[in-house]
C-alpha cells in the first residue's frame, strides 16, 4: 500500500516518501524507486532555514547603508542576514528594513527610555520637581535644583522647561 | 510523455573513441537523473554511470578511467563518451531514467576494425 | 563494488507451481536515511530489462500481484506463486544503494 502520511523530516511526492533538504541546502530531484532525494547546497549570499523541499535558495537579505542600514549579523546559508541601523537611527518595522532617526524629547520631556538599532526613544513629560530644557534624545528630566541646600530660597519658580532661579535670603537688618 | 532515445555509431573501429547521445524529452535534466547500462550479447546488464539532476556524475569503478558522461541540459541532452575501446565494449547501450521505468530503446555499438 | 549473486542460474518450472529465486548481496543495502534499494528485473529476448519490483517490495505500476519481493540486509527472494508461460525470461536483481550500482548474473526462468 502507498503512504498516505510520512515521518517528520520527509514529503510525500509520488506515492513515496522522500527526505526533505536539511537547511543549507535545496532540492534537486525528488528520491525514486533507485535513489535518495537529491539536495545541493545553498550558493554563496542564499540561504535555508528550514528542512525543505525548495528548488531555491532565499537569498541573504541585502543591508542597505542608503536607508541607514548596516549588518549586525551575517547571513549563513541556514540564516538570513539581519540587519540594525546605523548610530542614531532605528527600525521601522520588526524585518528591518529600513531606518529613521531617533526622536529627540522636546523641552518638557525627558528620555524615559534610549532608543536602540530596532526601538525608538521612549518619553515622558516631566513631573512636578523636574525639568528637561533642550530637545534631546538622551537627556533625562533634571531634578530643580535645590536652593535650601545651598543655603540660597527660591527666587522663580521651576516648570517642566526650566529650572528654579535660586538668589540670596534677605538679611534681616 | 517521457521519452529518451539513444543514438551511437553502430560501427566503432578498436582504441578508437565511442560517443553517444541520449536526447530526452518530457522532463527536464536539471531535475532528473540519467544513468547508462550497456548489455553485451547473451550477458547481462552492466552499469556504466550516471549524471544527477545537481550535475554530478558517478561511475563504474571498471569503466571509471575512460568513460565521462555529460549533459547539455539546454539541449536535453545527456551525452557518453568512453575512449580505448576493445571487441568487449561491445554491447547495447542504453539511457535510462532514474524513477519509473524509464528506458531507451538502446543503440547496438559494434567494435571491430 | 557490491556483489550481487542469484542462485539458481536456471529455473524450469511447471505452469501453475510457484518459483522462487534468492539473490545476496556482499554488503547490507540498507541506506543511512533507512531505505534498501534492492530490485528485480525480468528481461524477455529481444527486450531491455523491465522492472518488476523496487525497494525488496513494491511492486511496479501494472506488475501482477503474483510477483512479490521480500527480505532485508543482505537476503532477498523474489516469489511467483503462480507461473505462467509469459514470465519465461531473465530475471535480475539489481542494487542502487551503493555506487556504482550493480546487478546480479541473472536467473533463466524456463516453462518445463
Known amino acids: 500500500e502507498p503512504p498516505t502520511a510520512c515521518r517528520e523530516k520527509q514529503y510525500l511526492i509520488n506515492s513515496q516518501c522522500c527526505s526533505l533538504c536539511q537547511p543549507g541546502q535545496k532540492l534537486v530531484s525528488d528520491c525514486t524507486e533507485f535513489t535518495e532525494t537529491e539536495c545541493l547546497p545553498c550558493g554563496e549570499s542564499e540561504f535555508l532555514d528550514t528542512w525543505n523541499r525548495e528548488t531555491h535558495c532565499h537569498q541573504h537579505k541585502y543591508c542597505d547603508p542608503n536607508l541607514g542600514l548596516r549588518v549586525q549579523q551575517k547571513g549563513t546559508s541556514e540564516t538570513d542576514t539581519i540587519c540594525t541601523c546605523e548610530e542614531g537611527w532605528h527600525c521601522t518595522s520588526e524585518a528591518c528594513e529600513s531606518c529613521v532617526l531617533h526622536r529627540s524629547c522636546s523641552p518638557g520631556f525627558g528620555v524615559k527610555q534610549i532608543a536602540t538599532g530596532v526601538s525608538d526613544t521612549i518619553c515622558e513629560p516631566c513631573p512636578v520637581g523636574f525639568f528637561s530644557n533642550v530637545s534631546s534624545a538622551f537627556e533625562k528630566c533634571h531634578p530643580w535644583t535645590s536652593c535650601e541646600t545651598k543655603d540660597l530660597v527660591v527666587q522663580q519658580a521651576g516648570t517642566n522647561k526650566t529650572d528654579v532661579v535660586c538668589g540670596p535670603q534677605d538679611r534681616l537688618r | 510523455q517521457v521519452q529518451l532515445q539513444e543514438s551511437g555509431p553502430g560501427l566503432v573501429k578498436p582504441s578508437e573513441t565511442l560517443s553517444i547521445t541520449c536526447t530526452v524529452s518530457?522532463?527536464?535534466?536539471?531535475?532528473?537523473?540519467v544513468y547508462w547500462i550497456r548489455q553485451p550479447p547473451g550477458k547481462g546488464p552492466e552499469w556504466m554511470g550516471m549524471?544527477?539532476?545537481?550535475?554530478?556524475?558517478d561511475y563504474s569503478t571498471s569503466l571509471k578511467s575512460r568513460l565521462t558522461i555529460s549533459k547539455d541540459t539546454s539541449k536535453s541532452q545527456v551525452s557518453l563518451k568512453m575512449s580505448s575501446l576493445t571487441a568487449a565494449d561491445t554491447a547495447v547501450y542504453y539511457c535510462?531514467?532514474?524513477?519509473?521505468?524509464?528506458w531507451g530503446q538502446g543503440t547496438l555499438v559494434t567494435v571491430s576494425s | 563494488d557490491i556483489v550481487m549473486t542469484q542462485s539458481p542460474l536456471s529455473l524450469p518450472v511447471t505452469p501453475g507451481q510457484p518459483a522462487s529465486i534468492s539473490c545476496r548481496s556482499s554488503?547490507?543495502?540498507?541506506?543511512?536515511?533507512?531505505?534498501?534499494?534492492l530490485h528485480w528485473y525480468l528481461q524477455k529476448p529481444g527486450q531491455s530489462p523491465r522492472l518488476l519490483i523496487y525497494?525488496?517490495?513494491n511492486r511496479f505500476s501494472g506488475v501482477p500481484d503474483r510477483f512479490s519481493g521480500s527480505g532485508s540486509g543482505t537476503d532477498f527472494t523474489l516469489k511467483i506463486s503462480r507461473v505462467e508461460a509469459e514470465d519465461v525470461g531473465v530475471y535480475y536483481c539489481?542494487?542502487?544503494?551503493?555506487?556504482?550500482?550493480?546487478f546480479g548474473g541473472g536467473t533463466k526462468l524456463e516453462i518445463k
Open positions: 525497494k525488496v517490495s
Open positions: 518530457g522532463f527536464s535534466l536539471s531535475r532528473y537523473s
Open positions: 535510462v531514467r532514474t524513477d519509473g521505468d524509464y
Open positions: 549524471m544527477w539532476g545537481g550535475g554530478s556524475t
Open positions: 539489481s542494487q542502487s544503494t551503493h555506487v556504482p550500482w550493480t
Open positions: 554488503q547490507s543495502l540498507a541506506s543511512s536515511q533507512g531505505n534498501t534499494y
